[in-house]
């Protein structure tokens, strides 16, 4: 309606004696500015006077001055928009209607506001969500329809009379729409909060109690249970009986079902609050709890760990690691189910007790071949001693041990024999798979670990073998000690150092490079004739007749070896010279006569000289002197001389007779 003034403010305001009231208010006049304002208490319109009667709490004048007695009430507004009011302090008799009489130049308006002032501070109001469940966060709200700038208040939350630790968020509203103070508390209730009293307490600025509101919490929760066990420590021996009782300490709403669980799995046909276990076995050891359900869900008790004690079971041995390499470390672990845990262990190796080993683990820092075998153990606890289990096998791997090269042949071995050797070893793990031989040769291996040397050489000195599995172990080399006839027999001239001249002292040595066995005999021969049995052949004064082809033989028990033929050469001056005549020593004149100087010399004669009966040298230097035609005056005695590098020799005289031919005689 356009003929109305427009006001906005809370419909009713609430306060209590001695507090204050703050009235937020806005308006819009029909025309112009506000010229007059009167605040009435319970105004009533007087038709006769056409004016409002009632107590005037506040009155403004045109000059804007306010009488001093009106200071309790303050108009905080203005001439065109704001009509906010404050009453401080407010009194009980201020309750009722407040009338705001507004006048402009041409228009008038009466606006009514309800004021409710109580004798004492009124309580706030707690608002709860429709349902509260344990552990789910909820917001508790405490609302008080009061706020006034001049009268500070606070709202505090209490649980069972004790201030709550959670931080509350307080907010105030002083608007034309609403006036209130609100405190909000975020809270995660637990099942134990069910039935507890929550209080919102109104306090003044000094913390003095003014009023409060209380509610009882209805926290929906799963059943809360307590489990009781007999015996109380839940430790029993096999064959004993155990009773467990489930008590519901709280449930909201009421519980509907009950069940029992062992190690998280439901036990069938156990739906009462008592669980009776008769003559328990070790398999019944475990974690027990009871479960009770309601509409919220299932609730579980704490777990009871039932320990059924028993003597150790037959033990098993775990080996870290098998197979083990010799020299490595190995750990043995004795495993035996027992309750309580075993306190003592007895260890066995191949059935024999291992002294001093009383712990769950046995550590061997350096494994040796004889550590191999079966390891077993016995565990012991307060209830008894377990049985020895089957044990575990430790396999110790190592290179072949005590490898030897063995000669299979009868001794001695002779050059050219076929030699068989075997490679032997004492033990090996894993088994030997191959063999190696040193030195390498084109030899035959007829079977594993056997070597055959055909036609063994005199110089095959030592052989070594290795037996190999994952590793190779070498034997010490074995000497074949091959026996052979003397080798490299040769004749060597010891003296003279230079060439041999007739008359020299001569020594020949029979040399050889090696012989096995070392004991030897010597033989010298010339032209098949035995000359001596020493290593040396000596000539005190060599003669040309000693020249020739010499051999020496060296023999041992295996055989004999001859040297190559060695030629002995004796150097001598020409000897045994003679002049031979051809066709004879009597030649007819006119014929041909040849004189030859024959000699024995080494080296051969290199130069000849011919002499006549007068010892006159003739101008001829070859071996033959040819007279052609021969004359009677050539008759006479001739001799020759031969020369070589060693010396000279001369022949005796030889006479040539030249006789007259029949023609010459005929002429005479």
């Amino acid at each position: 309606d356009s003929s109305k003034w427009v006001f906005e403010h809370p419909e009713t305001l609430y306060a209590w004696e001695g507090a204050c009231v703050w009235i937020p208010c806005t308006y819009r006049a029909l025309d112009g500015d506000l010229e007059s304002f009167i605040l009435f208490h319970n105004p009533e319109y007087n038709k006769n006077t056409s004016k409002f009667d009632g107590t005037r709490l506040y009155e403004s004048t045109k000059d804007g001055k306010v009488p001093s007695e009106q200071k309790r009430v303050q108009f905080l507004g203005d001439k065109n928009k704001n009509c906010t009011l404050s009453i401080h302090p407010v009194h009980l008799n201020d309750s009722g209607q407040l009338g705001l009489r507004m006048e402009s130049k041409t228009e008038k308006w009466m606006e009514r506001i309800h004021l409710n002032v109580s004798e004492r501070p009124f309580p706030p109001h707690i608002q709860l969500p429709p349902e509260i469940q344990e552990s789910q966060e909820v917001t508790l709200t405490c609302l008080l329809n009061f706020s006034c700038y001049g009268y500070p208040i606070q709202l505090q939350w209490l649980l069972e009379g004790v201030p709550m630790r959670q931080a509350a968020v307080t907010s105030t509203s002083l608007t034309i729409k609403s006036v209130f103070t609100r405190s909000e508390l975020k809270f995660s209730p637990q099942w134990s909060h069910h039935g507890k009293i929550v209080t919102c307490q109104l306090q003044d600025a000094d913390g003095k109690f003014l009023s409060n509101d209380t509610v009882q919490l209805n926290v929906k929760h799963t059943p809360k249970l307590e489990i009781k066990v007999t015996p109380s420590d839940a430790i029993v021996r096999e064959g004993d009986s155990v009773t467990m009782t489930c008590e519901v300490s709280s449930s909201n709403p009421e519980y509907t079902t009950v069940s029992w669980l062992k190690d998280g799995t439901s036990l069938k046909k156990q739906n009462t609050f008592t669980l009776n276990l008769r003559e328990v076995t070790k398999d019944q050891s475990g974690k027990y709890c009871c479960q009770v359900s309601n509409d919220v869900g299932p609730g579980r008790s704490e777990e009871v760990f039932l320990q059924v004690q028993y003597a150790p079971e037959p033990s098993t041995v775990q080996i870290l690691h098998s197979p083990a390499v010799e020299g490595s470390q190995v750990e043995f672990l004795c495993m035996s189910l027992a309750n309580p845990l075993p306190t003592n262990y007895t260890w066995y190796h191949n059935g024999k007790e291992m002294q001093g080993r009383t712990e769950e683990k046995v550590h061997i820092p350096k494994i040796l071949p004889w550590h191999a075998g079966t390891y077993s153990c016995v565990a012991e606890n307060i209830l008894g001693t377990g049985q020895r289990g089957p044990g575990a096998e430790l396999d110790v791997q190592y290179p072949p041990k005590k490898v030897t090269t063995v000669i299979q042949n009868p001794m001695p071995i002779r050059e050219g024999d076929t030699v068989t050797l075997s490679c032997n070893y004492n033990s090996s793990n894993p088994s030997v798979t191959r063999y190696e031989w040193k030195p390498h040769g084109a030899w035959e291996e007829p079977s594993l670990g056997v070597l055959k040397i055909q036609n063994v050489g005199w110089d095959n000195t030592t052989i070594a073998c290795a037996a190999c599995n994952s590793w190779c172990s070498w034997a010490s080399p074995v000497a074949l000690n091959v026996q052979y006839a003397p080798r490299d027999v040769r004749v060597r001239k010891i003296k003279p150092l230079s060439e041999i001249h007739s008359g020299n002292s001569v020594s020949l040595q029979c040399d050889f490079s090696s012989s096995h066995p070392k004991e030897v005999q010597f033989f010298w021969e010339k032209n098949g004739r035995l000359l001596g049995k020493e290593s040396q052949l000596n000539f005190d004064s060599i003669s040309p007749e000693d020249a020739g082809s010499y051999s020496c033989w060296v023999n041992n028990s295996i055989g004999q070896t001859a040297s190559k033929a060695w030629t002995l050469e004796v150097l001598y001056a020409p000897r045994r010279l003679r002049v031979s005549m051809s066709p004879g020593d009597q030649v007819m004149e006119g014929k041909s006569a040849t004189l030859t100087c024959e000699s024995d010399a080494n080296p051969p004669v290199s130069h000849y000289t011919w002499f006549d009966w007068n010892n006159q040298s003739l101008p001829y230097h070859s071996q033959k002197l040819r007279l052609e035609p021969v004359k009677v005056q050539h008759s006479g005695a001739y001799w020759c001389q031969g020369t070589n590098s060693v010396g000279k020799g001369r022949s005796p005289l030889s006479t040539l007779t030249v006789y007259y031919s029949p023609e010459t005689i005929g002429r005479r």
Partner: antibody, heavy 117, light 106 residues
């Protein structure tokens, strides 16, 4: 490198108690047993007792009442205590490591103890 | 307790000769026997363990044999440095030393 060092008094009076300490390095007392051995001057070696890896002990029956062997694995130390010492106990005392199935291959220089008033 | 008896107490030999030392146990010791060499002023030195296994670095002239109760240490050809006292040790059941054999130069 395995090392053993025996230490203790050089001279002990008759009736007194001898305490010798063996400090080891290069191996752990949780892996090796330790035996104590002695040798009087000019006489044979005599085994006194052993402390096993697990801490158990065994003693030479002739000396059992007088001997105690203990150890501290963390300190790598073994202690021999011998009560009521007599001049015949004058000897060189050795601590020696060994383990199951293996003889003693590491010997320290030993410590010579003389019992005299 | 196991008792070990060594024989002879003294053995007089020349370098190059063969030495045979004996050790007899009062019961079967399952080959768990070791042999030690000791020279004056020195700690014992392990030669052989587990009856016949030569310790690393021990010359091949030293060898061990035996089983059950009877065990032997053999030195195939004596060297001058081999003259010393030799002890056997059983480690089958606790530990026991023999009384020793003195090997001296003849």
């Amino acid at each position: 490198e395995v090392q053993l060092k025996e230490s203790g008094p050089v001279l002990v009076k008759p009736t007194e108690t001898l305490t010798l300490t063996c400090t080891v390095s290069g191996f752990s007392l949780t892996s090796y047993d330790i035996s104590w051995i002695r040798q009087p001057p000019g006489k044979a070696l005599e085994w006194l007792g052993v402390i096993w890896t697990g801490g158990g002990t065994n003693y030479n029956s002739a000396l059992k009442s007088r001997l105690t062997i203990s150890k501290d694995n963390s300190k790598s130390q073994v202690v021999l205590t011998m009560t009521n010492m007599d001049p015949v106990d004058t000897a060189t005392y050795y601590c020696v490591p060994h383990y199951y199935g293996y003889a003693m291959d590491y010997w320290g220089q030993g410590t010579t103890v003389t019992v005299s008033s | 307790e196991i008792v070990l008896t060594q024989s002879p107490a003294t053995l007089s030999l020349s370098p190059g000769e063969r030495a045979t030392l004996s050790c007899r146990a009062s019961q079967d010791i399952n080959k768990y026997i070791a042999w030690y060499q000791q020279k004056p002023g020195q700690a014992p030195r392990l030669l052989i363990h587990y009856t016949s296994t030569r310790q690393t670095g021990i010359p091949a002239r030293f060898s061990g044999s035996g089983s059950g109760r009877d065990y032997t240490l053999t030195i195939s050809s004596l060297e001058p440095e081999d003259f010393a006292v030799y002890y056997c040790l059983q480690y089958d059941n606790l530990l026991t030393f023999g009384g020793g054999t003195k090997l001296e130069i003849k």
